[in-house]
C-alpha cells in the first residue's frame, strides 16, 4: 500500500511523517538552530533507531539538538527531553557542550561555537 | 508552504516526489534488481543532482541500477537510457559491468555478482 | 574546600561482597557525579563506574553484572558495592568527583583511597 | 577499550632539568586526554586536562600538548617534589581507560 508522507516543507525529506533537511553552510550550533527555527523546525533530535533508521547512513557530521547540561552531566534536546539511554554512541573528542551527529547513531561532542554543517528536523 | 511528499510505498523515504528506500541485507546486483522489482521499483537512477541532491549525503556503497555495456561501451540505467555526462564521477576500482552509488555522486565498478547493500527507488 | 572521605572494610572474604561509602563535603551531589576508579599492581588504574548527579549510573561492561552504585544527597554520601569478589579484586578502591568541564570524566578531586585485600 | 601506551615506564632526571613523558592512545581521541601525579601512597591528583589546560593550583612549570593519537606531558624545571608516578587517562569514550603510568626518579 501506498501513502503521502507529510506535510513537509518544500524539498524536505519526509520519512515516516518526519521531515528532515540537511544543509551544507556551516555555522555554529546557535546560528544552527536559530536557522531552523526560522523554519518552523528544530535541530535534528534523535528518539527511535527504528523510526529514524534513515540516519545510520547519512555521511559526515552535523549539528544535532543535543546539548550537555554541566549542571547534571546530562545531554538534553532542545525540547528539554533527556537523552535515552543506549540511542547515541557519544564519543568525545575534545571538550564541548553541544554534539553532531554522524553516521549509525553517533554523536560527537564540539565546541557549540564551531562552525558545521546541521540537520533541521519538522514533527508532523 | 508546506506539502505532501509521494505516494510511496510504506515506509519510504519520500523526496521532491521521488520515493527511495535502502536496503541492508546484501545482494549481487540481480538480486537487488529482483528485490526492487518486486515491490514495483527499480534500482536508483541518479538523474539529477539538484533533484537528488539528498544523495551527495548517503554513506557507503549500494548497488544502483546502472550497467556496462560491453559492446559499445556506454553505461546505461536498467531503463534504457544512457548516463548523462557529469552526473557521476565513475571509478573503476576493479573490473566488472554494474555499479555501486558511493556519496557524493560517484559510481564504483564492481562484478555485478558481489553481494552489496542497494538503493530502490519509485519515481511518482 | 572539597573532599571525598572512604569508609570501608580492608578485608573480604572470597565471594563476598564488598561495600564502600564516600562521603562528600564542600560541593553538592544535585550536581556533581561520582566515579569510581581502582588500582592494583596488576591491572593499574581501572575504571569502574559513575553516578551522574540526575542519580543515573554507567559500568565499566567487564563489571556491570556485579557492581551498583548509589547514592543519598541529602546525606552526601555515595555507594559502592561489588559483589563476588575474588583474589585478583584486591586493590585500593577510590572515589572521584567528575568535573563540570566536558562530559565523560575529567576527574578533579580523589578520595583516600580503601585498600581492600580478598582472602580468606 | 582504547589502550593508552605510556613510554618510558621510568624516568630518572636531575633537578632543574625539563622532562617529557609519552602517551599514545590506540585511535585518534582527538584532545581528550587528561594527566594525573600520584605520590607514594597518596591518590591520583589532576595536572592537565583536555591534553594541554592548565588546573588551578598546579605549579606552571606542568604543561601539555598533543592531539590524535599523541600526548606529552612536560614538566620544565623538575623539583624533588615532583617525584611521584605520572598517568594519562582517555575521556573519548567508555570505558574510560588510564596509562600503565610513568614513574619519575630523581638522580
Known amino acids: 500500500t501506498e501513502s503521502y508522507c507529510g506535510p513537509c516543507p518544500k524539498n524536505w525529506i519526509c520519512y515516516k511523517n518526519n521531515c528532515y533537511q540537511f544543509f551544507d553552510e556551516s555555522k555554529n550550533w546557535y546560528e544552527s538552530q536559530a536557522s531552523c527555527m526560522s523554519q518552523n523546525a528544530s535541530l535534528l533530535k534523535v528518539y527511535s533507531k527504528e523510526d529514524q533508521d534513515l540516519l545510520k547512513l547519512v555521511k559526515s557530521y552535523h549539528w544535532m539538538g543535543l546539548v550537555h547540561i554541566p549542571t547534571n552531566g546530562s545531554w538534553q534536546w532542545e525540547d528539554g527531553s533527556i537523552l535515552s539511554p543506549n540511542l547515541l554512541t557519544i564519543i568525545e573528542m575534545q571538550k564541548g557542550d553541544c554534539a553532531l551527529y554522524a553516521s549509525s547513531f553517533k554523536g560527537y561532542i564540539e565546541n557549540c561555537s564551531t562552525p558545521n554543517t546541521y540537520i533541521c528536523m519538522q514533527r508532523t | 508552504t508546506e506539502s505532501y511528499c509521494g505516494p510511496c510505498p510504506k515506509n519510504w523515504i519520500c523526496y521532491k516526489n521521488n520515493c527511495y528506500q535502502f536496503f541492508d541485507e546484501s545482494k549481487n546486483w540481480y538480486e537487488s534488481q529482483a528485490s526492487c522489482m518486486s515491490q514495483n521499483a527499480s534500482l536508483l537512477k541518479v538523474y539529477s543532482k539538484e533533484d537528488q541532491d539528498l544523495l551527495k549525503l548517503v554513506k557507503s556503497y549500494h548497488w544502483m541500477g546502472l550497467v556496462h555495456i560491453p559492446t559499445n561501451g556506454s553505461w546505461q540505467w536498467e531503463d534504457g537510457s544512457i548516463l548523462s555526462p557529469n552526473l557521476l564521477t565513475i571509478i573503476e576500482m576493479q573490473k566488472g559491468d554494474c555499479a555501486l552509488y558511493a556519496s557524493s555522486f560517484k559510481g564504483y565498478i564492481e562484478n555485478c555478482s558481489t553481494p552489496n547493500t542497494y538503493i530502490c527507488m519509485q519515481r511518482t | 574546600q572539597v573532599q571525598l572521605q572512604q569508609s570501608g572494610p580492608g578485608l573480604v572474604q572470597p565471594s563476598q561482597s564488598l561495600s564502600i561509602t564516600c562521603t562528600v563535603s564542600?560541593?553538592?551531589?544535585?550536581?556533581?557525579?561520582v566515579h569510581w576508579v581502582r588500582q592494583s599492581p596488576g591491572k593499574g588504574l581501572e575504571w569502574l563506574g559513575v553516578i551522574w548527579s540526575g542519580g543515573s549510573t554507567d559500568y565499566n561492561a567487564a563489571f556491570i553484572s556485579r557492581l551498583s552504585i548509589s547514592k543519598d544527597n541529602s546525606k552526601r554520601q555515595v555507594f559502592f558495592k561489588m559483589s563476588s569478589l575474588q583474589a585478583n579484586d584486591t586493590a585500593i578502591y577510590y572515589c572521584?568527583?567528575?568535573?563540570?568541564?566536558?562530559?565523560?570524566?575529567?576527574?578533579?578531586?580523589w578520595g583516600q583511597g580503601t585498600t581492600v585485600t580478598v582472602s580468606s | 577499550d582504547i589502550q593508552l601506551t605510556q613510554s618510558p615506564a621510568i624516568l630518572s632526571v636531575s633537578p632543574g632539568e625539563r622532562v617529557s613523558f609519552s602517551c599514545r592512545a590506540s585511535?585518534?581521541?582527538?584532545?581528550?586526554i587528561h594527566w594525573y601525579q600520584q605520590r607514594t601512597n597518596g591518590s591520583p591528583r589532576l595536572l592537565i586536562k583536555y591534553a594541554s589546560e592548565s588546573i588551578s593550583g598546579i605549579p606552571s612549570r606542568f604543561s601539555g600538548s598533543g592531539s590524535g593519537t599523541d600526548f606529552t606531558l612536560s614538566i620544565n624545571g623538575v623539583e624533588s617534589e615532583d617525584i611521584a608516578d605520572y598517568y594519562c587517562q582517555q575521556s573519548n569514550t567508555w570505558p574510560l581507560t588510564f596509562g600503565a603510568g610513568t614513574k619519575l626518579e630523581i638522580k
Open positions: 585511535q585518534s581521541i582527538g584532545t581528550s
Open positions: 564542600g560541593f553538592s551531589l544535585t550536581i556533581y557525579g
Open positions: 572521584s568527583r567528575k568535573s563540570h568541564d566536558g562530559y565523560y570524566g575529567v576527574m578533579d578531586y
